[in-house]
């Protein structure tokens, strides 16, 4: 057989026995001569190129470049490949010699004690137990212990080859502590040496670099990269690093095994690459490869090296951010810089601190933006090393889709007395203000549900055929007033009013407001009734802890069974056919209330009294009366709003002022609160008494001092008090000039 590629000038060495395989008997002499065209050498089994006593290599007597290999009294262990080759080349000729020794069919290893086979528990991997044979066609099986198991070649994955040994899937013997080969010759069993089975792992689960990304340094700083390989047990790992400047003087590599918890099914290996003072040439890709022999995994990271610390805003930094109320707003601080800058956000000059509604970090996040978040936000970047600062202003504009104030106040089922004039109002708040508010209407019976129409709690009116209020034929005569603008609760609102000249037919009215970010609508159920009437005593809007009573008056000749109910806290569940006046047809949603019945000559009056009204008493109250003849139920609904108690406050300040004798002083003190506070004036801490020159008007709100005199000088206090306490403001009035002498002569 020939090994290697024939060179142009050299022929392969020629062996005296021109065979690939030679079979000889034990105890005979093996002699092979090799001839060639330059210096030759022999290699033989076991001692692959050493000087063994029994093997003799001699120069031929009959020519140059010729060597004879002689082994007297060969034994089975001499079985193997004999190779003649040119020195320092790959050119060689090989013959495989079997020394048939039936007493020792397996070739023993050099140590003749035991061998070691390394295996992995991989289903797809096979292992070769090197029990080579001195006879080519032996019947060989593999014995594994303990427990004892025998494996026989199956012509597939289990096989024996005299030149190679016994091949078997490694997982089949991974349980075993030792294996050996066994041959049967003439009913006699022969065993190879024992091989200890060592299970080695190969699996690498992952290779992690730390830091994993975004590594930035400036020239002269130390780079430390940790590469951690996590593997299965019984694995050895080789680390290999690739990096830009491989000739680095200050590079240090340290590899070590990391301790893992006992009972862990995993091993950890760490390789640390350290470069003490990086230079610009160290910038680039750093790759760590971990190899277990059967598996290699790698990970890379990019290291950026800056000339010096710096900070700057990125080109994508926004200057104007527009958002709609309720959205999450994210304003990232886009910067370039090393090291990462300290980032501080300010709103209208005030530092922002993170809380549950706002996160002020690399990204300014406002969880649910509201109008009060509108303003100028300044982000200041500070380089922690150089202390260089950069600032940028971002304007946040928060838009508000139209919100209709009455939507939350007025019940969707208010009833209106027949023939009365009524005003319906839509107060719209929107940013930017609505570009239009339109009114629509529809007859109530046209909007009664059909079984096919799905009705939701949020949209209890499934009506689609809205008509413009200009077309009021068949409905109530309508007039839409011009929009007005009002400052309500400190907000600029648009007020649109619709006047119904005479409430003759039950209808639904809808106002719709639209601006650039959305639309809002309010549907008003305008149910006209000739039935009972509700009045509130003593006041339309009581304050909490006050008493209020709802009076339901009905004509006794027409109605009977007056009953007061309160609508449940949930919006009304609307069922098929329940409009108009769904409350009357669904008493399940109502709470019956205790009330007192009174009568006069024509009417029954059912009075429901709320002593010490609370905010929980707010809601829709329903008076139900039954027609004496038809037994049809009539409902009237009235919404009760209970005002919260608010301690007195005084809006605006009293100003200190200087006035000349004889002039007038006019000051006002506007107080708010619930219940409305009483206003009192004091001068130098004594109650101010009205006289010809001191006039108090508008419930003491306005104080006028006519023809001031020197004695009017002093400290004036306006005090507003209610059961919830007092508020006060003070001002000093200075009176200048000399008092005129009164001529009494």
């Amino acid at each position: 057989a020939s090994v290697g590629l024939p060179s142009v000038s050299l022929d392969l060495p020629r062996l005296s026995i021109q065979k690939d395989i030679l079979t000889i008997k034990a105890n005979t002499t093996l002699q092979i001569t090799c001839r060639g065209q330059r210096d030759l050498d022999w290699l033989w089994p076991n001692n692959q190129s050493g000087s063994e006593q029994r093997v003799e290599v001699t120069e031929c007597s009959d020519g140059l470049f010729c060597k004879t290999l002689t082994i007297p009294k060969v034994i089975g262990n001499d079985t193997g490949a004999y190779k003649c080759f040119y020195r320092e080349t790959d050119l060689a000729s090989v013959i495989y010699v079997y020394v048939q020794d039936y007493r020792s069919p397996f070739i023993a290893s050099v140590s003749d004690q035991h061998g070691v086979v390394y295996i992995t528990e991989n289903k797809n991997k096979t292992v070769v137990i090197p029990c080579l044979g001195s006879i080519s066609n032996l019947n060989v099986s593999l014995c594994a212990r303990y427990p004892e198991k025998r494996f026989v070649p199956d012509g597939n994955r289990i096989s024996w080859d005299s030149k190679k040994g016994f091949t078997i899937p490694s997982y089949m013997i991974s349980y075993a502590g030792m294996v050996f080969c066994e041959a049967k010759i003439n009913d006699e069993s022969y065993q190879s040496i024992m091989y200890i089975v060592v299970v080695v792992g190969y699996r690498i689960y992952d290779v992690v670099l730390s830091p994993s990304h975004g590594i930035e340094l400036s020239v002269g700083e130390k780079l430390v990269l940790n590469c951690t390989a996590r593997t299965e047990l019984n694995v050895g790992i080789d680390f290999n690093w690739e990096y830009p400047s491989s000739k680095h003087q200050h590079k240090k590599l340290v590899n070590r095994d990391l301790k893992t918890q006992s009972g862990s099914e995993m091993k950890k290996f760490l390789s640390t690459l350290t470069i003490d003072g990086v230079t610009r040439s160290d910038q680039g890709l750093y790759t760590c490869a971990a190899s277990s022999g059967l598996m290699t995994k790698k990970n890379s990271t990019f290291v950026r090296v800056h000339e010096k610390p710096f900070v700057a805003f990125g080109s994508g930094m926004e200057s104007l951010v527009e958002a709609t109320v309720g959205e999450r707003v994210r304003i990232p601080a886009k910067y370039l810089g090393y090291p990462p800058p300290e980032i501080k956000w300010y709103k209208n000059g005030i530092p922002l601190e993170s809380n549950h509604t706002i996160k002020a970090g690399h990204v300014l996040t406002i969880m649910e933006v509201s109008e009060r978040d509108t303003g100028n936000y300044t982000v200041i970047l500070t380089n922690p090393i150089s202390k260089e600062k950069q600032s940028h202003v971002v304007s946040l504009v928060v838009y508000v889709p139209p919100q209709i104030g009455e939507k939350s106040l007025i019940s969707p089922v208010d009833s209106y007395q027949y023939g009365t004039t009524q005003t319906l109002t839509c107060t719209v708040y929107a940013i930017p203000p609505p570009h239009h508010i339109h009114w629509y209407w529809q007859l109530e019976e046209e909007c009664a549900n059909e079984p096919s129409q799905a009705v939701s709690v949020t949209n209890p009116y499934p009506c689609e055929e809205w008509r413009s209020v200009e077309d009021f034929q068949g409905g109530n005569k309508i007039e839409v007033n011009k929009n007005q603008f009002a400052l309500i609760e400190g907000k600029n609102k648009t007020v649109s009013t619709l006047v119904i000249q005479a409430a003759n037919v039950s209808a639904l009215y809808k106002c719709e407001a639209v601006n650039k970010v959305g639309r809002g609508e309010r549907v008003i159920s305008f149910h006209v009734t000739r039935g009972p009437e509700i009045t509130l005593q003593p006041d339309m809007q009581p304050t909490e802890q006050e008493s209020v009573s709802l009076w339901c008056t009905a004509d006794r000749s027409t109605f009977e069974n007056l009953t007061w109910y309160k609508l449940g806290p949930q919006p009304l569940p609307i069922h098929v056919g329940e409009l108009p006046t769904p409350v009357c047809k669904n008493l399940d949603t109502l709470w019956k209330l205790n009330a007192t019945m009174f009568s006069n000559s024509t009417n029954d009056i059912l009075i429901m009294e709320l002593k010490n009204a609370s905010l929980q008493d707010q809601g829709d109250y329903v008076c139900l009366a039954q027609d004496r003849k038809t037994k049809k139920r009539h409902c009237v609904v009235r919404q009760l709003t209970v005002l919260e108690r608010v301690a007195p406050t005084i809006t605006g300040n009293l100003e200190n002022q200087t006035t000349s004798i004889g002039e007038s002083i006019e000051v006002s003190c506007t107080a708010s609160g619930n219940p409305p506070p009483q206003i009192m004036w004091f001068k130098d801490n004594e109650t101010l008494v009205e006289d010809s020159g001191i006039v108090l008007k508008d419930g003491n709100r306005n104080l006028t001092i006519r023809r001031v005199r020197k004695e009017d000088e002093g400290l004036y206090t306006c005090q507003a008090c209610s059961v919830l306490g007092c508020a006060k403001v003070e001002a000093f009035f200075i009176i200048e000039g000399a008092q005129e002498k009164t001529n009494l002569e």
């Epitope: 009045t535 005593q537 003593p538 008493s547 209020v548 009573s549 009076w551 007192t596 009174f598 006069n600 000559s601 009056i605 009075i607 009294e609 002593k611």
Partner: nanobody, 124 residues
Amino acid sequence: QVQLQESGGGSVQAGGSLRLSCVASGYSVSKNSMGWFRQAPGKEREGVAGINEGGTATYYANSVKGRFTISQDNARNTVYLQMNTLKPEDTAIYYCAAGSPDPPPLIESVVKYWGQGTQVTVSS
């Protein structure tokens, strides 16, 4: 200073009658609405009858309708409650009440002024 002074209370057998009077001082009964309340032992005070400003309309609780009559004498500035066919459940302290012109004082929250009360006891 407004004062309401009740009189006419006392003990009576079931089925008997009593007439309560309420004299108002510092307050015009013709220009305001007036009423009568009662409070039985262990119960809340309840409206019994009312009369509006000018005496054109009278109001009664269901429990006394047809048995009690409210009236007023503007000249004497007095309000009366005529109680007929009295029952043991009518036993209570009866209070005179004054309200604004409207509504009549049929419930406590619209009462502006109260009298001291007079005891009525009906035995079976």
